[in-house]
């Protein structure tokens, strides 16, 4: 009785999810059979979240849009073991989009979620950030510093990174 | 090659407003905010704020709001700065200034002057 | 606001000499510091950005370095044409702030 209510919970939290994924891939979280971590297919998944790379170019707006739309947003990247985890599935030609922007040019960064911004716990290239018109943040590989931050004009297409909470059931 | 070209000297009793306008030509105008920069007889430089040419928004120098009002028509490529409730302290000349990478202002306008004289 | 301290005020130095002068921020500004050029004419342009960047068109005789607070602009070979006032400025928090100015005179 208490498995056929758990399943009927599940399938129900499932049913939520299958209009924005129709597939998801679920893993055991620890011993306990009750607990399943699910990102959608084909996303990857690290730590608690779930990260899509999305190859079509857009803007910075066009782009969180396009995150939200799949109940996620722009990537948010809070340790340099995350964003270790990213980086592995970019491509080092292409530049990618952050949820990070500083919407009135005044050099106040902010992230999408509202997580505080932390200028201790930043990956900007040397010499970057440098200019009051470029006030969105992408993340691209430079042969001499490897993968970090950037800021360029929001209105310029760029693939983009998009990330959300694993999904439990 | 980048150019601002600036409108000419103004004359202007104490109490009135004047508009300057600043047109920039050479680069694609609104991909460059512009900034206008203040220097008064024999002083040094002081920086008035910015506006962007993309979104129309402005970050003013706290010394300097209600005095000035920043606007842009991308039609014409032309930014232009609007002094109010002139006194004597206003007379000086007015720069424009295109917005640069590093936090820098690359290439700037002739400067108008104004002068603020009953 | 981020004080500018400019020195000399006024400089005169020879045809060929090599000329410094020095801007100290009151804190730090992390690299963006910026140099201009203003020319009797009223005319200003940009020489140096980031500390050491050379504009476009600057020639190479003028140079830039420093950090932290205490940044310096350098001369060498001065020539007739530099005759200007020089602008240090820094770009790391706005509102953004000069220094006061230094003359150079040709003796």
């Known amino acids: 009785n208490f498995m056929y209510s758990k399943t009927v919970k599940r399938l129900s939290k499932l049913r939520e999810y299958q209009q924005y994924h129709p597939s998801l891939t679920c893993v055991m979280e620890g011993k306990d059979i009750e607990d399943w971590s699910c990102c959608p297919t084909p996303w990857t998944s690290f730590q608690s979240s779930c990260y899509f790379i999305s190859t079509g170019m857009q803007s910075w707006t066009k782009s969180q849009k396009n995150c939200s739309v799949m109940g996620a947003d722009l990537v948010v990247i809070n340790t340099r073991e995350e964003q270790d985890f990213i980086i592995q599935n970019l491509k080092r030609n292409s530049s990618y989009f952050l949820g990070l922007s500083d919407p009135g040019g005044r050099r106040h960064w902010q992230w999408v979620d509202q997580t505080p911004y932390n200028e201790n716990v930043t990956f900007w290239h040397s010499g970057e950030p440098n200019n009051l018109d470029e006030r969105c943040a992408i993340i691209n590989f430079r042969s001499s510093e490897e993968w970090g931050w950037n800021d360029i004009h929001c209105h310029v297409p760029q693939k983009s990174i998009c990330k959300m909470k694993k999904i439990y059931i | 090659q980048v150019q601002l070209q600036q409108s000419g000297a103004e004359v202007v009793k104490p109490g009135a407003s004047v508009k300057i306008s600043c047109k920039g030509s050479?680069?694609?105008?609104?991909?460059?905010?512009m900034h206008w920069v203040k220097q008064a007889h024999a002083k040094s430089l002081e920086w008035i704020g910015v506006?962007?040419?993309?979104?129309?928004?402005?970050n003013y120098n706290q010394k300097f709001k209600g005095k000035v009002t920043m606007t842009v028509d991308k039609s014409s490529s032309t930014a232009y700065m609007e002094l109010s409730r002139l006194t004597s302290d206003d007379t000086a000349v007015y720069y424009c200034?295109?917005?640069?990478?590093?936090?820098?202002?690359?290439?700037w306008g002739q400067g108008t002057l104004v002068t603020v004289s009953s | 606001d981020i004080q500018m301290t400019q020195s000399p005020s006024s400089l005169s130095a020879s045809v060929g000499d090599r000329v410094t002068i020095t801007c100290q921020a009151s804190q730090d500004i992390s690299n963006y510091l910026n140099w201009y050029q203003q020319k009797p004419d009223g005319t200003v342009k940009l020489l140096i950005y980031y500390t050491s960047r050379l504009h476009t068109g600057v020639p190479s005789r003028f140079s830039g370095s420093g950090s932290g607070t205490d940044y310096s602009l350098t001369i060498s070979n001065l020539d007739q044409e530099d005759i200007a006032t020089y602008y240090c400025q820094q770009g790391n928090t706005l509102p953004w702030t000069f220094g006061g100015g230094t003359k150079l005179e040709i003796k």
């Open positions: 200034a295109r917005n640069g990478n590093f936090y820098v202002m690359d290439y």
């Open positions: 050479g680069y694609t105008f609104t991909d460059y905010s």
């Open positions: 506006i962007s040419t993309y979104y129309g928004d402005s």
